[in-house]
Every structure is written in structure tokens, then in C-alpha cells.
């Protein structure tokens, strides 16, 4: 798309090019309205590397509730429904942005924070180290 | 969680209980320093439901670059290294928060936005619908 110069209606800030503190509207716009509402909701049970979801709540963080995946087994479920330890269940992790209240307990002042969350699990071939 | 009284050193805002616009410090605090540095970086190739990662860049979004997973196969890789179509590779999706410049092209004014991203893939048993 075409680059448009800075909007004259922007709020003022000290440094236009590299802001450190910005204004954020917390009325969340959800761009996912057309997606399948079921999404990954039953995959945690049907996967060959099934996982459980654990609730992590922190009132000083926004969003305050994050669900974390923990793989149920070290191995993967085979065609017979048994755990095959020749394969490994591993968490798929993603770095996400959250808002952390700063100073603590302030309702309208935050700092961006990066946290690593486990979203689900996948079954991988193990790395075998051969000893000479 | 426990309600903690509001910090007297908080910046002022019109509505203390339900802020719509808040101040956010963009100096990111990284809480991941003690985690395994490798994270999921090689799982996309070793998984029985391997995926490719596609780069999505949007200068009006923060973070501007997001890498999206796309499953390589409909089926899963079996022990012989072939695709088994009796199983399904499916994306594990997560809703994440990003900041969207609002008004557009403003360097210091954003709105929170929820987007759905595919983080990786997992192998699941298909749901079989039996016709009577």
C-alpha cells in the first residue's frame, strides 16, 4: 500500500519517531469473527501428543487469565492407543505480548511484556545422540 | 484474585475502575530469559505433523512481524516417513493481543486487537461420521 504521512489528528508525544510511552485503547477489536469458533478446542484430546490446559491468573497482567498447555505424556499415542516412547510429545511455545501494570496496582498504566506460553503439543522424532 | 488498593503514585485517568485508554510503556520487559533458548525452533521439521512458517508483516501493527504456521500435509508422517491420510495434521491456533495504530499511521496511539494465529501443527485422529 501507499505510505501516508503521519496523521495530523494523532495525539501529541515527545518523540514522534520512536515513542516509549503510547496511548492504547483497551476496547478490543476482534479480527477473528469469521473464523471457525471451534478452532483447536478439541485437539488437545484427539492429538497423538495430547495435552492438558492449566489456568494461569495474574491480576497485574492483561489479559489476566492465560491457559497454558502441558503435554500429558513424554511419548506419543500410537495406533493402539498406547504411549510410544520412541517418539516425544513436546510443547509448541510462542512468545506473546501482554500488558503488565506498572507501577503495580495502577489501573491505567502498563508496560509491555513478552512471555513464553505453551499453546499445545506436537509429536516429534527424538534427536538420538550416538556415543562413539 | 485478591484486590490490592490502588497505588497512590499512579498516573491520573478519568475513570479509575474501567479504563478505556491507558498509557503503555513500549520498553519491553522479557520474562523469558531463564527459559530454554531453543524453544520450538526445530520442531516444525521433526514433527509428525510438520509445518512451514510464513512471514506476515504489517507496519500498522505492533509487533509488525508475525510468523504463521501452515501444516505441510493433510495427513501425518508415519514411521516409514510417508504421509498417512488416516490421521490429520491440524494447526494449533491461539488468540493473541497486538496493538493496531489508531488513528492509522500515528506513531504513539494504538488500539488493542485480538488476532488468531497458527503457532504449529499437531497430529489428530480424524472424526469419522458414520452414515446409517
Amino acid at each position: 500500500g501507499i505510505t501516508i504521512p503521519r496523521n495530523p489528528g494523532c495525539p501529541n508525544s515527545e518523540d514522534k519517531n520512536f515513542p516509549r510511552t503510547v496511548m492504547v485503547n483497551l476496547n478490543i477489536h476482534n479480527r477473528n469473527t469469521n473464523t471457525n469458533p471451534k478452532r483447536s478446542s478439541d485437539y488437545y484430546n484427539r492429538s497423538t501428543s495430547p495435552w492438558n490446559l492449566h489456568r494461569n491468573e495474574d491480576p497485574e497482567r492483561y489479559p489476566s487469565v492465560i491457559w497454558e498447555a502441558k503435554c500429558r505424556h513424554l511419548g506419543c499415542i500410537n495406533a493402539d492407543g498406547n504411549v510410544d516412547y520412541h517418539m516425544n510429545s513436546v510443547p509448541i511455545q510462542q512468545e506473546i505480548l501482554v500488558l503488565r501494570r506498572e507501577p503495580p496496582h495502577c489501573p491505567n498504566s502498563f508496560r509491555l511484556e513478552k512471555i513464553l506460553v505453551s499453546v499445545g503439543c506436537t509429536c516429534v522424532t527424538p534427536i538420538v545422540h550416538h556415543v562413539a | 484474585g485478591i484486590t490490592i488498593p490502588r497505588n497512590p503514585g499512579c498516573p491520573n485517568s478519568e475513570d479509575k475502575n474501567f479504563p478505556r485508554t491507558v498509557m503503555v510503556n513500549l520498553n519491553i520487559h522479557n520474562r523469558n530469559t531463564n527459559t530454554n533458548p531453543k524453544r520450538s525452533s526445530d520442531y516444525y521439521n521433526r514433527s509428525t505433523s510438520p509445518w512451514n512458517l510464513h512471514r506476515n508483516e504489517d507496519p500498522e501493527r505492533y509487533p509488525s512481524v508475525i510468523w504463521e504456521a501452515k501444516c505441510r500435509h493433510l495427513g501425518c508422517i508415519n514411521a516409514d516417513g510417508n504421509v498417512d491420510y488416516h490421521m490429520n495434521s491440524v494447526p494449533i491456533q491461539q488468540e493473541i493481543l497486538v496493538l493496531r495504530r489508531e488513528p492509522p499511521h500515528c506513531p504513539n496511539s494504538f488500539r488493542l486487537e485480538k488476532i488468531l494465529v497458527s503457532v504449529g501443527c499437531t497430529c489428530v485422529t480424524p472424526i469419522v461420521h458414520h452414515v446409517a
Partner: antibody
Framework: EVQLVQSGAEVKKPGASVKVSCKAS????????VHWVRQAPGQGLEWMGV????????AYNQKFEGRVTMTADTSTSTAYMELRSLRSDDTAVYYC????????????????WGQGTLVTVSS | EIVLTQSPDFQSVTPKEKVTITCSAS?????MHWFQQKPDQSPKLWIY???NLASGVPSRFSGSGSGTDYTLTINSLEAEDAATYYC?????????FGQGTKLEIK
């Protein structure tokens, strides 16, 4: 201090492969992509592709698709670029450069570059 | 791919003179970056996102433009500005650079 230190010059025969390394220091390796750019003698700059060390995601210039592989080892903060089936017109200085994934840390541009690695392809 | 054409290819300039380098894109791009490169050195980020000066770049430099036409301007040339300048787009793959403009001091 941010530094990208590349491996030394290489002389290769046509048809061979070369693997150039780029060791990063002074910043969080997974907060930045590593892009590779080359420059033939007396010529301009040519973008080859990018790797995101955090996810392992890669995007290549189609011109090099099938001949190039970019990898990253987060335990040593090192990125690698391997180019196969070398031809004489691959003779160039190969640069690695970082590109920010997060707003607070960089201007969304290739802001630091390695010193370059000269690869000479000659029979 | 988007082709970036810089003009001029070469310019010999007197100190204190005003210099304008243009970069024309074959399709509209959303931002332009500019790099400075001196002989036997790696490129340096000079101007990012069309008009923002990179750290340490003198204020006599400026950048502007939108769509397909972008400009790097040096208000009052100094001897240390002798270098090759490249424009670069990142709006579509593959990312591309202009062919470069070499500035020489008379």
C-alpha cells in the same frame, strides 16, 4: 554493544557449497530476524532471505529458492547461510544483518550489519 | 518484483552544495529505507521508514516521499558524505534495493 561477526573468506569451485556463519552478540538473538544480503564486486545489494531465530521461520528470495538454506542456533546466537551449486556469478561479499521484530527495540529496518564474508567461486 | 531506480547513478558535488537523490519504484511501496556505504565497508542504515534519521546521522540529511517516488536530500554537503547511497523497499517479496547513487566530492 551490538555486533554481528561473520566467518572468514572462502574460495570454492563451481558446483560446490559454502556455509557462512554470523555470530550475534550485544542483544537478545530471538528478538531480531537475521537477513542475508549479498553484493557482487562493484555491484549493488541483493536481498537473499530471512530467518527468524525464535521460530526457525524462513523466507527466501525466489531467485535462490532450492539453492539456499538459512538456519540459526539459538544456543550460540549464530545464524548460518548455506548456498549450494555455486556458480562464478555467486562471487560476492555476503552480509548478515538484523531486523527488529519488536517496536521498542529498533526502527523496523536492517540496522546492524556484519563485516561481510567474501566468497570467491573459481575453477 | 519491485524494481527501484535511483537517479542519478553518479554525482560529483562541491562541498556546501544541496544534493537530491531520487528513488522511483515500479509499484507503490509503503516505506523506503536508505543505506550509506563507503568503500570496503558494510552498508549502514541511514534513513528508515522514509523520513527518520538513523542514530548518528547528521541533521543535514532528510528523506521524504510516498507511493512510487522517494527522495534523500543533503542540505549542505560535507566531505564525509562521499559514499554510495542505496534505497530499499520491504513492501513485497523479494525485498529489493536501488542500483545505488555514488556521490563524489569535487
Amino acid at each position: 554493544e551490538v555486533q554481528l561477526v561473520q566467518s572468514g573468506a572462502e574460495v570454492k569451485k563451481p558446483g560446490a557449497s559454502v556455509k557462512v556463519s554470523c555470530k550475534a552478540s550485544g542483544y537478545t538473538f530471538t528478538d531480531y530476524e537475521v537477513h542475508w544480503v549479498r553484493q557482487a564486486p562493484g555491484q549493488g545489494l541483493e536481498w537473499m532471505g530471512v530467518i527468524d531465530p525464535g521460530t526457525g521461520g524462513v523466507a527466501y528470495n525466489q531467485k535462490f529458492e532450492g539453492r539456499v538454506t538459512m538456519t540459526a542456533d539459538t544456543s550460540t546466537s549464530t545464524a548460518y547461510m548455506e548456498l549450494r551449486s555455486l556458480r562464478s556469478d555467486d562471487t560476492a561479499v555476503y552480509y548478515c544483518t538484523r531486523y527488529s521484530l519488536f517496536y521498542g527495540s529498533s526502527p523496523y529496518a536492517m540496522d546492524y550489519w556484519g563485516q561481510g564474508t567474501l566468497v570467491t567461486v573459481s575453477s | 518484483e519491485i524494481v527501484l531506480t535511483q537517479s542519478p547513478d553518479f554525482q560529483s558535488v562541491t562541498p556546501k552544495e544541496k544534493v537530491t537523490i531520487t528513488c522511483s519504484a515500479s509499484s507503490s511501496v509503503n516505506y523506503m529505507h536508505w543505506f550509506q556505504q563507503k568503500p570496503d565497508q558494510s552498508p549502514k542504515l541511514w534513513i528508515y521508514r522514509t523520513s527518520n534519521l538513523a542514530s548518528g546521522v547528521p541533521s543535514r540529511f532528510s528523506g521524504s516521499g510516498s507511493g512510487t517516488d522517494y527522495t534523500l536530500t543533503i542540505n549542505s554537503l560535507e566531505a564525509e558524505d562521499a559514499a554510495t547511497y542505496y534505497c530499499q523497499q520491504r513492501s513485497s517479496y523479494p525485498w529489493t534495493f536501488g542500483q545505488g547513487t555514488k556521490l563524489e566530492i569535487k
